[in-house]
């Protein structure tokens, strides 16, 4: 009895915080504080975040929800996950595009734009690593093509074309003079 018993809630703890005069229980994720509790250790009046707003964590003092981010169309971004009351929109790149960070020290919150993935097939090369977080990693030339400079050149179909050593090795024959 009296004040010697330890309280079930304490303003210094994580579960309850002093809001206004009282130690109040916080609002759950996805809810904002409409009015603080009006009794010791009571429940605050919490309302669900309106559409296009969110709060990701349990909170004690947020009297409004954060606005959901809009994906940057100019940077070719798309919404991978729509905004909900408890989570912001997750922006990314559509299939066939990859994230190119706009800053050198890239973290999840860094600004970015989407770049179209390299099409190894169009370059007549094998796909070594599929494009997702970074550009496609293309491998050696496809059968029927040989390395020439930076690209892959088609094996000649007649003896009229020249076939240097690398061509001969890949294409299986040497031009006769």
């Amino acid at each position: 009895q009296g004040g010697t018993r330890s309280p079930r809630c304490d303003c210094a703890g994580d579960f309850h915080k002093k809001i206004g005069l009282f130690c109040c229980r916080g609002c759950p994720a996805g809810h904002y504080l409409k009015a603080p509790c009006t009794e010791p250790c009571g429940n605050s009046t919490c309302l669900v975040c309106p559409q296009d707003t969110f709060l990701a964590w349990e909170n004690h003092h947020n009297s409004e929800c954060a606005r959901c981010q809009a994906c940057d169309e100019q940077a070719s971004q798309v919404a991978l996950e729509n905004c909900s009351a408890v989570a912001d929109t997750r922006c990314g790149c559509k299939p066939g595009w990859f994230v190119e960070c706009q800053v050198s020290q890239c973290v999840s919150s860094s600004p970015f734009y989407c770049q179209p993935c390299l099409d190894c097939g169009a370059l007549h090369r094998h796909t070594r690593l599929l494009c997702s977080r970074r550009d496609t990693d293309c491998g050696t030339c496809l059968p029927g093509f040989y390395e020439h400079g930076d690209g892959c050149v088609s094996c000649p179909t007649s003896t009229l074309g020249s076939c240097p050593e690398r061509c001969a090795a890949v294409c299986g024959w040497r031009q006769m003079f």
Partner: antibody, heavy 122, light 111 residues
Framework: EVKVVESGGGLVKPGGSLKLSCAAS????????MSWVRQIPEKRLEWVAA????????YYPDSVKGRFTISRDDARNTLYLQMSSLRSEDTALYYC???????????????WGQGTSVTVSS | DILLTQSPASFAVSLGQRATISCRAS??????????IHWYQQKPGQPPKLLIY???NLESGVPARFSGSGSGTDFTLNIHPVEEEDAATYYC?????????FGSGTKLEIK
């Protein structure tokens, strides 16, 4: 030494307005919740307003809600009570009181001023 | 609103004897492990002075002859042994919910 000193009381006609002040010293005013409590001579005490520290939430009983406004100026260490639409039943001695501190608020009032007298009469 | 009823309204006690003042709440003032009742002493021409907070905790500087007890709806302030300077009006106050309310007061006289 903790001190709270009220001022601003006086005679006012029904329907009139008055603003009470409470100057605090000897403690970190901004860290404490504060209240106004009134007392009709030889009668019971009545809590009339409270304001929290930090986030400035305000609270009133129904008897004064919409007519009285409590506020504070932490830079000036001063508590205020703006009273409007005054009635004869608002006649009383008005005390400024500090709420007892601590991590776990108890809402007991540990320091009181000497009070300022408000008379509402035509 | 929680109504606090104090009894007796007034009484006299001989010097050195025990004075017991009762405060009854119209509903429970207990929650979260605490009983939200506080006691004040008021002498003529002076503001109230906090004696006891949360039912039984003695405020700093208050003599140990003052003690408080109770839970739920029934609370008691005891003064023993009573001294001359204890002649005053005593009020209980709750802070279980809004609005905070005070008892009607008990006037103690010393015989």
């Amino acid at each position: 030494e903790v001190k709270v000193v009220e001022s601003g009381g006086g005679l006012v006609k029904p329907g009139g307005s008055l603003k009470l002040s409470c100057a605090a010293s000897g403690f970190v005013f901004s860290s404490y919740d504060m209240s106004w409590v009134r007392q009709i001579p030889e009668k019971r005490l009545e809590w009339v307003a409270a304001i929290s520290s930090g986030d400035y939430y305000t609270y009133y009983p129904d008897s004064v809600k919409g007519r009285f406004t409590i506020s504070r100026d932490d830079a000036r260490n001063t508590l205020y009570l703006q009273m409007s639409s005054l009635r004869s039943e608002d006649t009383a001695l008005y005390y400024c009181a500090r709420h007892r501190g601590g991590n776990y608020p108890q809402y007991a009032m540990d320091y009181w001023g000497q009070g300022t007298s408000v008379t509402v009469s035509s | 609103d929680i109504l606090l009823t104090q009894s007796p309204a007034s009484f006299a006690v001989s010097l050195g004897q025990r004075a017991t003042i009762s405060c009854r709440a119209s509903k429970s003032v207990s929650t979260s492990g605490y009983n939200y009742i506080h006691w004040y002493q008021q002498k003529p021409g002076q503001p109230p002075k906090l004696l006891i907070y949360l039912t039984s905790n003695l405020e700093s500087g208050v003599p140990a002859r003052f003690s408080g007890s109770g839970s739920g709806t029934d609370f008691t302030l005891n003064i023993h042994p009573v001294e001359e300077e204890d002649a005053a009006t005593y009020y209980c106050q709750h802070s279980r919910e809004l609005p905070f309310t005070f008892g009607s007061g008990t006037k103690l006289e010393i015989k």
